[in-house]
């Protein structure tokens, strides 16, 4: 895919792009593509966004493949319809603590942000908001049905659940670390970002993953048992290669991903670790890139969409990243 | 009516410049690629130089990338072949075409202007 | 890459088949896995005109008698009834690979 062959672009005419994105050329001059925007992946051809000071971050020299789109250094964020200078920490609401950090915003909860599975002693586990509290708490529902309780016993497994990392401190360093971000897409390739200052020099820096909940052409829903609502962890039959702007990872991965639900829960990542994965291009350029593997899933009425401008997108985060 | 007219072609001497012109009109200028093909007398077609939609991208027959140069004026409609140090062998009709840059090249061509390089 | 066209000139009666080859010294697969190879025909004291794009595509207002065939660096362009307006020399062209190249020309006359 370099820039050295005659250009042709596809047979259909110009994109239209969506409100706010800008329609440019591809970074080989060749065709008109829609730019990606802030976390997006890029590549030569798919560049950034220009007119919003967006490069394609490619990390280290020898990965000039494929890369996410980043703000320039000192970038301010618009949050909520506010705008944060780089460096600006704020909270979005009394439940999270931000930094903006060279356009990317990264928040930690100030709130107890596990995901409560049901157990023998309490079955149905609900939060819900206590009057005078700004953090929700769990509330164990009676159920309706006592006869359920018996013989369903022994589906439930109590989840280990880990919330953001505690607090070091390290030479002269208070080292923090945002919860990785959701994956920017609900199936295929996406990508997940958090902001930390765990490096020798205490900076805040942009950290970036490959993430898949699981593939697009999978059809989730056949597979639920019958009298079940969600497949939470659905076996992957056969090990499979990841694919990344048609280069394929070099060794094949027995992944787990999230299933889904029939009656409106969500399923994401509950539990993750990062690991890199080694991909080989058309052209022999091999690239090493980090990735998101689940090791749980939890399903969940917490979906994206609710009210809270940024409570939604962090219950689709990532718990206890073991990276 | 989707119409190429070439201009500036002539008689120079060996050494000599000519900048050629070519005028579109029947469409949107902006949303093509544009290029330059000449053909010498008597013999075959040969491609000469493309550019991209706003000049930013320019692509030129490697033996006269020194010698000639391909650029487009959007506002007037017009794209424009540029050639110095004129040699005998850069005798030929020089067709001004549209190039579609997706499915297909040249779907529309010019008349065509002579460029006479004689001393 | 060199586009080699045979026959270099060729006699044929109104209403019979004409066929043309073009040999390309190299495959002419784009990256993007298209194969831009097309058919001009240049009519005595004309500009060239497409016939044919992407190997078998007509281009707009070509008749159907033509039709272009081929694959890797073997492609053919057939007329299937010759007409009188189909005289004029006939160029293979591929826009794969810089330089972007033409046959040396094939030319039709009528019998």
């Known amino acids: 895919q370099n820039c050295s062959g005659p250009c042709r672009c596809p047979d259909e005419p110009a994109p239209r792009c969506p409100a706010g994105v800008s329609l440019v050329l591809d970074g080989c001059g060749c065709c008109r593509v829609c730019a990606k925007q802030l976390g997006e992946l890029c590549t030569e051809r798919d560049p950034c966004d220009p007119h919003k000071g967006l490069f394609c971050d490619f990390g280290s020299p020898a990965n000039r493949k494929i890369g996410v789109c980043t703000a320039k250094d000192g970038a301010p964020c618009i949050f909520g319809g506010t705008v944060y200078r780089s460096g600006e920490s704020f909270q979005s609401s009394c439940k999270y603590q931000c930094t903006c950090l060279d356009g990317a915003v990264g928040c930690m909860p100030l709130c107890s942000m596990d995901v409560r599975l049901p157990s023998p002693d309490c079955p149905f586990p609900r939060r819900v908001k206590l009057p005078g509290k700004c953090c929700e708490e769990w509330v164990c529902d009676e159920p309706k049905d006592q006869t359920v309780v018996g013989p369903a016993l022994a589906a439930y497994r109590l989840e280990d659940t880990f919330g953001p990392d505690p607090t070091m401190i390290r030479a002269n360093c208070l080292v923090q670390t945002t919860e990785w971000s959701a994956c920017s897409k609900t199936c295929g390739m996406g990508i997940s970002t958090r902001v930390t200052n765990d490096n020798a020099s205490c900076r805040l820096e942009k950290q970036s993953r490959l993430c898949m909940v699981r593939p697009c052409e999978a059809d989730l829903e056949e597979n639920i048992k019958k009298g079940k609502k969600c497949i939470r962890t659905p076996k992957i039959s056969k090990p499979i290669k990841f694919e990344l702007s048609g280069c394929t990872s070099m060794k094949t991965y027995r992944a787990k991903f999230c299933g889904v639900c029939t009656d409106g829960r969500c399923c994401t990542p509950h539990r993750t670790t990062t690991l890199p994965v080694e991909f080989k291009c058309p052209d022999g350029e091999v690239m090493k890139k980090n990735m998101m593997f689940i090791k749980t899933c939890a399903c969940h009425y917490n979906c994206p969409g609710d009210n809270d401008i940024f409570e939604s997108l962090y219950y689709r985060k990532m718990y206890g990243d073991m990276a | 009516e989707v119409q190429l007219v070439e201009s500036g072609g002539g008689l120079v001497q060996p050494g000599g410049s000519l900048r050629l012109s070519c005028a579109a009109s029947?469409?949107?200028?902006?949303?093509?690629?544009m290029a330059w093909v000449r053909q010498a007398p008597g013999k075959g077609l040969e491609w000469v130089a493309n550019i991209n939609y706003d000049g930013s991208r320019t692509d030129l027959l490697e033996s006269l990338k020194s010698r000639f140069t391909i650029s487009r004026d959007n506002a007037k409609n017009s794209v424009y072949l540029q050639m110095n140090s004129l040699r005998a062998e850069d005798t030929a009709v020089y067709y001004c075409a549209r190039d579609t840059s997706r499915g297909s090249y040249f779907d529309v061509w010019g008349a065509g202007t002579t460029v006479t390089v004689s001393s | 890459v060199v586009m080699t066209q045979t026959p270099l000139s060729l006699s044929v009666s109104l209403g019979d088949q004409a066929s043309i080859s073009c040999k390309s010294s190299?495959?002419?697969?784009?990256?993007?896995?298209?194969?831009?190879l097309e058919w001009y025909l240049q009519k005595p004291g004309q500009s060239p005109q497409l016939l044919i794009y992407k190997v078998s595509s007509r281009a707009s207002g070509v008749p159907d008698r033509f039709s272009g065939s081929g694959s890797g660096t073997d492609f053919t362009l057939k007329i299937s009834r010759v007409e009188a307006e189909d005289l004029g020399v006939y160029y293979c062209?591929?826009?794969?690979?810089?330089?972007?190249?033409f046959g040396q020309g094939t030319k039709l006359e009528i019998k």
């Open positions: 190299q495959s002419i697969v784009h990256y993007n896995g298209n194969t831009y």
């Open positions: 029947g469409f949107t200028f902006s949303d093509y690629y």
């Open positions: 062209f591929q826009g794969s690979h810089f330089p972007l190249t």
